[in-house]
Interface confidence: low
């Protein structure tokens, strides 16, 4: 996944911050369960190597997923974090590239995790360029 700079040079996105706000639930999700489920989602659905999911932060109702992938870390055949974020974005928007009816069925210990707002930040290897994408 590449980002176009002002000078038209194509550079690989190395840090993506996915900021989610989930719909109200009876209580907060257990952080470690949430962390495990999101890591599994990226590993099993988007085939992203676990080492590229740098962190999952949670402060109800905000979830932040950090994807990091330096050029030196990425081996041939590794899924690009930009592609994983793109698939995730399409899932969240209900425009999945690989789902049947019902969209992404994301659950933490059986409790549905329903996203009501998503912000995806793409941070490029050549600073200080910055881009932000708002999803509705």
């Amino acid at each position: 996944h590449t980002a176009a700079q002002d000078n038209d040079e194509l550079v690989r996105t190395h840090h993506i911050l996915i900021d989610l706000r989930h719909r109200p639930t009876a209580g907060a999700f257990n952080h470690s369960d949430l962390d495990a489920e999101l890591r599994r989602l990226f590993r099993e659905r988007y085939r992203l190597h676990p080492k590229f999911v740098a962190a999952v932060h949670y402060e109800q109702p905000t979830i932040q997923i950090e994807l990091r992938q330096n050029t030196s870390q990425k081996a041939a055949g590794d899924v690009d974090i930009g592609d994983a974020a793109y698939y995730f974005e399409r899932d969240i928007k209900g425009e999945s590239l690989f789902q049947g009816r019902g969209g992404l069925d994301l659950r933490v210990r059986g409790e549905p995790l329903q996203v009501e707002r998503t912000l995806i930040y793409y941070l490029d290897e050549i600073p200080p360029k910055f881009s932000m994408k708002r999803l509705t």
Partner: antibody, heavy 121, light 107 residues
Framework: QIQLVQSGPELKKPGETVKISCKAS????????MNWVKQAPGKGLKWMGW????????TYAEEFKGRFAFSLETSASTAYLQINNLKKEDTATYFC??????????????WGAGTTVTVSS | DIVMTQSHKFMSTSVGDRVSITCKAS??????VAWYQQKPGQSPKVLIY???YRYTGVPDRFTGSGSGTDFTFTISRVQAEDLAVYYC?????????FGAGTKLELK
């Protein structure tokens, strides 16, 4: 290891019913959708539909609505394909294929060996 | 339904050759295309998913490329064991659809 084991070949007469099984092992059955694919002799692959292994909800391709039914025995990690009122054009090999993570399909990364159904009078 | 068209039903090749198989979708399917190999009497085996990603354990002589409507599957150096039928499949929207297949055979 991860595998899908299908039931053996079937020889049936037109009008009869056949039920094929696909037993999963080596992974959490309810984490992945299960698809069914038909391959007539000497022909290509045709997606029949899939079943949500979490909810049991089947989705059928238009051509396979009516006489075809997908079902589950979750406790046995097994998916089934039943074909009613068999016709000669149902003669084919039927594959089950594991779909994507969650209640969904993706590409099929694990396949059964296939079950050959022959319909002949 | 999205129609996946593989322009060649057969392709002749020699061991060591480079061969490319094309697949055209009747509408935009983004990068949601997989490639499978099927040998006689066997079930299909996924080689490439999401247009360009090799599935785990697939040799690096197999590559995929493309997006939108035009996709290419390439074997850089054909081995005898690569002789098989290759199918493309779109996983963009139901019903999932396959190409008719391209049989790779020796010259």
């Amino acid at each position: 290891q991860i595998q899908l084991v299908q039931s053996g070949p079937e020889l049936k007469k037109p009008g009869e019913t056949v039920k094929i099984s696909c037993k999963a092992s080596g992974y959490t059955f309810t984490n992945y959708g299960m698809n069914w694919v038909k391959q007539a002799p000497g022909k290509g692959l045709k997606w029949m539909g899939w079943i949500n292994t979490k909810t049991g909800e089947p989705t059928y391709a238009e051509e396979f609505k009516g006489r075809f039914a997908f079902s589950l025995e979750t406790s046995a990690s097994t998916a089934y394909l039943q074909i009613n009122n068999l016709k000669k054009e149902d003669t084919a090999t039927y594959f089950c294929g594991r779909g994507g993570y969650g209640s969904s399909y993706w590409y099929f990364d694990v396949w059964g060996a296939g079950t050959t159904v022959t319909v002949s009078s | 339904d999205i129609v996946m068209t593989q322009s060649h039903k057969f392709m002749s090749t020699s061991v060591g050759d480079r061969v490319s198989i094309t697949c055209k979708a009747s509408q935009d399917v983004s990068i949601a295309v997989a490639w499978y190999q099927q040998k006689p009497g066997q079930s299909p085996k996924v080689l490439i998913y999401s247009a360009s990603y090799r599935y785990t354990g697939v040799p690096d002589r197999f590559t995929g490329s493309g997006s939108g409507t035009d996709f290419t599957f390439t074997i850089s150096r054909v081995q005898a064991e690569d002789l098989a039928v290759y199918y493309c499949q779109q996983h963009y929207i139901t019903p999932l659809t396959f190409g008719a297949g391209t049989k790779l055979e020796l010259k």
